[in-house]
Amino acid sequence: MRTEAQVPALQPPEPGLEGAMGHRTLVLPWVLLTLCVTAGTPEVWVQVRMEATELSSFTIRCGFLGSGSISLVTVSWGGPNGAGGTTLAVLHPERGIRQWAPARQARWETQSSISLILEGSGASSPCANTTFCCKFASFPEGSWEACGSLPPSSDPGLSAPPTPAPILRADLAGILGVSGVLLFGCVYLLHLLRRHKHRPAPRLQPSRTSPQAPRARAWAPSQASQAALHVPYATINTSCRPATLDTAHPHGGPSWWASLPTHAAHRPQGPAAWASTPIPARGSFVSVENGLYAQAGERPPHTGPGLTLFPDPRGPRAMEGPLGVR
């Protein structure tokens, strides 16, 4: 999100007052304020539903609650992607979809949510205790994943209240660092504001050279910077082995949907019109986890150019390879 603030032109500070520090003191709060406002912890919600008509058929819905630009979605089963899970689908917001059995139909529902229907028969079909995970790669938040499965006593047709997501992972270590900086910045901003109350404010007046005051553009993760690392897609994995995750499931009453937001209970938003987004510049881009390093030229471990963690529609399950095996 880019924030624009209209700020009147500033007169040079009077000698003996703020000096050179005056400019910095006035600009810094705007920058920090913008960062504080735009900063927010993203959430991923997962809903798993067993179809009433086909008891061995599942519908998985996942969504991303964040302000960033989704670059890729990966759906898997049997655990988190890269931790023993098997990729079911990979969805890219511009390039399309790659899906793997038993996925029957993966699709984007809105700009920030996807759904996946799984086949109800066959050796690879899911079972009631299957754990499904959805991983969203986005900029600037990084990679976020949540998992869910049907409660042990789930009756088709009923819906379970949202429960905390069992897994919330930011694969990019930098995320924590950024959060720390933002937190520090917000605290520092408050400190500056408090100090500012006790000192005379500098005189502000409109610019004499133009009828309109100049625009001071506060910095925030910009669309330009997002575009540089834009690698959209989604993947869904699932497996019918016993769930190894310590998932939280509601035990009250029968439930048909297991809804697992990453934090507080968030209901999925209704369908939203897709915003028209530019196609990322051509170049090598990596899988979901590596999507943000698309231009780095380094290949994620165990990945191949065409297998990609689903930057390539071809190898959703080849999430362990670069992008070739899409």
């Epitope: 399309g96 139909q105 993966a106 090598s284 297998l307 390539d312 529609p313 390879g321 095996v325």
Partner: antibody
Framework: EVQLQQSGPELVKPGSSVKISCKAS????????MDWVKQSHGQSLEYIGA????????SYTQKFKDKATLTVDKSSSTAYMELRSLTSEDSAVYYC???????????WGTGTTVTVSS | DIVMTQSQKLMSTSVGDRVSITCKAS??????VDWYQQKPRQSPKALIF???SRHTGVPDRFTGSGSGTDFTLTITNVQSEDLATYFC?????????FGGGTRVEIK
Amino acid sequence: EVQLQQSGPELVKPGSSVKISCKASGYTFTDYNMDWVKQSHGQSLEYIGAVNPNTGDISYTQKFKDKATLTVDKSSSTAYMELRSLTSEDSAVYYCARWSESWYFDVWGTGTTVTVSS
Amino acid sequence: DIVMTQSQKLMSTSVGDRVSITCKASQNVRAAVDWYQQKPRQSPKALIFLASSRHTGVPDRFTGSGSGTDFTLTITNVQSEDLATYFCLQHWNYPYTFGGGTRVEIK
């Protein structure tokens, strides 16, 4: 040079099965998905499905789910497609195609003509 | 299934001319459309991917454009070797679907 060399033409009887091959060379076989496409009577193309040589994962369109079986042999860098319960509708040219990391078929096989006739 | 319609089945052109082949999707497919060229008795070959990116080695007289539902492959300064059938493909949703093809003949 990247190449996908397919097996020769097949003349088979209705109700039987046929297994066609696609041998990859010039690149690391397990790095790219292999897809299969059908072209009937020189007309348009139909997407059949894909296999991930690295994991063996497969994907079929509903239409071909009960018709085709996709497999790979990593040791020989070869992908296979078996077609069963053949009818005259299955007479066509079948292509394997490599799915690139840029999300398109960047290399196509030489094609295998399958003719189903009694 | 998403239907990809190539309304012109045959287009006749002369060497040096410009020809535009269109492909219409039955629903929004974003930029997930490719163009392939198939010469007589040959396998298809990639021309354009993701609506407008040119495949390696493809002459710059081939240009792709469009997004959403309407896509165009334009050949400027047509050459005799461009005699072929051109197919569009969408991979936005399963099953992937091809257009019916447009055959370009040289007068």
